[in-house]
């Protein structure tokens, strides 16, 4: 768990407290809120980031149609329970003993219940669809250049292996980025698509999680790409379980 040795900060997570108290005086960083040690050479898990955020002071070219089982994070922020590896616990509860099951990106996938609710396993989100609308430009971006730029971004900024960016679709002004990562595909050390998507979402909102790095300046052959709307859909390996009442609402 090392960070930049010269000034002991965490380049990949500004929501940390760092000090040279690791083995041999090495810089060690702990996430705010949870106090868990984080690996500053890679992205911090979304669960630990959400927890830190809640602890901080308040201030074919055709587009993809999300499947009927796609989830959108409508519940917003909450203070999650994370396991010792920093992953979301399958069951989340609030202070009023209302509980629900979440997927690996922390999005609710069942109706809310009480403390008797059982969530047998953490269901993996294996497909994420990031739906963006860019601000008007003089003309459409070149699709291949846009595609390459977004793939480069996920490789370079978020350290997501190129094999996990399944596709980039573009129909001006809508851009869709598809991330896919099955349990069997994800090797030790691989960045999780859920974590990459969360960092990207925060970057797009101008809330970069990186320390001492400029905000996201997306350009396609020098032309600024400014995003005005973002929607993220999450597809789980096992479809969510909501009551018919919610589905017909």
């Amino acid at each position: 768990h090392t960070a930049a040795q010269d000034n002991c900060t965490c380049p990949t997570n500004k929501m940390t407290v760092c000090s040279p108290d690791g083995p041999g005086g090495r810089c060690q960083c702990r996430a705010l809120g949870s106090g868990m040690a984080v690996d500053c050479s890679t992205l911090t898990s979304k669960c630990l980031l959400l927890k830190a955020r809640m602890s901080a002071p308040k201030n074919a070219r055709t587009l993809v149609r999300p499947s009927e089982h796609a989830l959108v994070d409508n519940d917003g922020l909450y203070d999650p329970d994370c396991d010792p590896e920093g992953r979301f616990k399958a069951r989340q509860c609030n202070q009023t003993s209302v509980c629900w099951c979440v997927n690996s990106v922390g999005v609710r996938r069942t109706d809310k219940g009480d403390l008797s609710l059982r969530c047998d396993e953490l269901v993996r989100t294996h497909h994420i669809l990031i739906d963006l609308r860019h601000r008007p430009t003089a003309g459409a971006f070149n699709h291949s250049d846009l595609d390459a730029e977004l793939r480069r971004l996920f490789r370079e900024r978020y350290r997501l292996h190129p094999k996990f960016v399944a596709a980039v679709h573009y129909e001006q002004p809508t851009i869709q980025i598809e991330l896919r990562q099955n349990t069997s595909q994800k090797a030790a050390g691989d960045v999780d698509i859920g974590d990459a998507a969360y960092y990207f979402e925060r970057d797009i909102k101008g809330e970069s999680l990186f320390q001492g790095r400029g905000g996201l300046d997306l350009r396609v052959r020098g032309e600024p790409l400014q995003v005005e709307r973002t929607l993220i859909y999450y597809l789980d390996e096992i479809p969510p379980k909501f009551s018919m009442k919610r589905l017909t609402a």
């Epitope: 040795q5 595609d147 793939r151 480069r152 490789r155 370079e156 190129p162 094999k163 596709a167």
Partner: antibody, heavy 117, light 106 residues
Framework: EVQLVQSGPEVKKPGASVKVSCKAS????????IGWVRQAPGQGLEWIGE????????YYTEKFKGRVTMTADTSTSTAYMELSSLRSEDTAVYYC??????????WGQGTLVTVSS | DIQLTQSPSSLSASVGDRVTITCSAS?????MYWYQQKPGKAPKLLIY???TLQSGVPSRFSGSGSGTDFTLTISSLQPEDFATYYC?????????FGQGTKLEIK
């Protein structure tokens, strides 16, 4: 063991085209990116562009756009870089290199292309 | 395009010397990469993410820096270290390299 084996040296006349191959082994070809870099005699390294092998997405630098074509044959795990309208200043060693979460982690041995009348 | 300028362009040193090569970027980059190239051979990745040694690279090599200023240091030169070194960025297209620093035996 990851290996990138490039085709042999080529001598071409000005105005002609050259196609350099890069055969990959030791990894899942379509999971990666192949970048192309050239080095003129006694000079530094110059990036030409890259191809995402899984999707076929390509990015060429402005300097080479219109003259370079990058392709890949997934059945033989081979990437190709074709440069047309050759001129003497294109004389260089052309390298292919694998990209992942690094820009270039493994390199081919290089292919010398000589353009001379 | 982001220009990378290496300093010095060439350097004569002796075995056992401590050597520092700098790389200055025309605008801020996230990370710097360093490659070693020997005559007639392909470049070899030495350091990634500014300061992380690639597997198999001796610990006498180190990298540091941020923003626009980066350095590669060899703490005690060995005979096999005499080569040309290049810095490289990929924070934005097109990827660019420094012009190289040739390290020669004094």
């Amino acid at each position: 063991e990851v290996q990138l084996v490039q085709s042999g040296p080529e001598v071409k006349k000005p105005g002609a085209s050259v196609k350099v191959s890069c055969k990959a082994s030791g990894f899942t070809f379509t999971d990666y990116v192949i970048g192309w870099v050239r080095q003129a005699p006694g000079q530094g390294l110059e990036w030409i562009g890259e191809i995402y092998l899984g999707s076929g997405t390509i990015y060429y630098t402005e300097k080479f756009k219109g003259r370079v074509t990058m392709t890949a044959d997934t059945s033989t795990s081979t990437a190709y870089m074709e440069l047309s309208s050759l001129r003497s200043e294109d004389t260089a060693v052309y390298y292919c290199a694998r990209g992942s979460i690094f820009p270039f982690d493994y390199w081919g041995q290089g292919t010398l292309v000589t353009v001379s009348s | 395009d982001i220009q990378l300028t290496q300093s010095p362009s060439s350097l004569s040193a002796s075995v056992g010397d401590r050597v520092t090569i700098t790389c200055s970027a025309s605008s801020s980059v996230s990370y710097m990469y360093w490659y070693q190239q020997k005559p007639g051979k392909a470049p070899k990745l030495l350091i990634y993410d500014t300061s992380t040694l690639q597997s198999g690279v001796p610990s006498r090599f180190s990298g540091s820096g941020s923003g626009t200023d980066f350095t590669l240091t060899i703490s005690s030169l060995q005979p096999e270290d005499f080569a040309t070194y290049y810095c490289q960025q990929w924070s934005s297209y097109p990827y660019t390299f420094g012009q190289g620093t040739k390290l020669e035996i004094k």
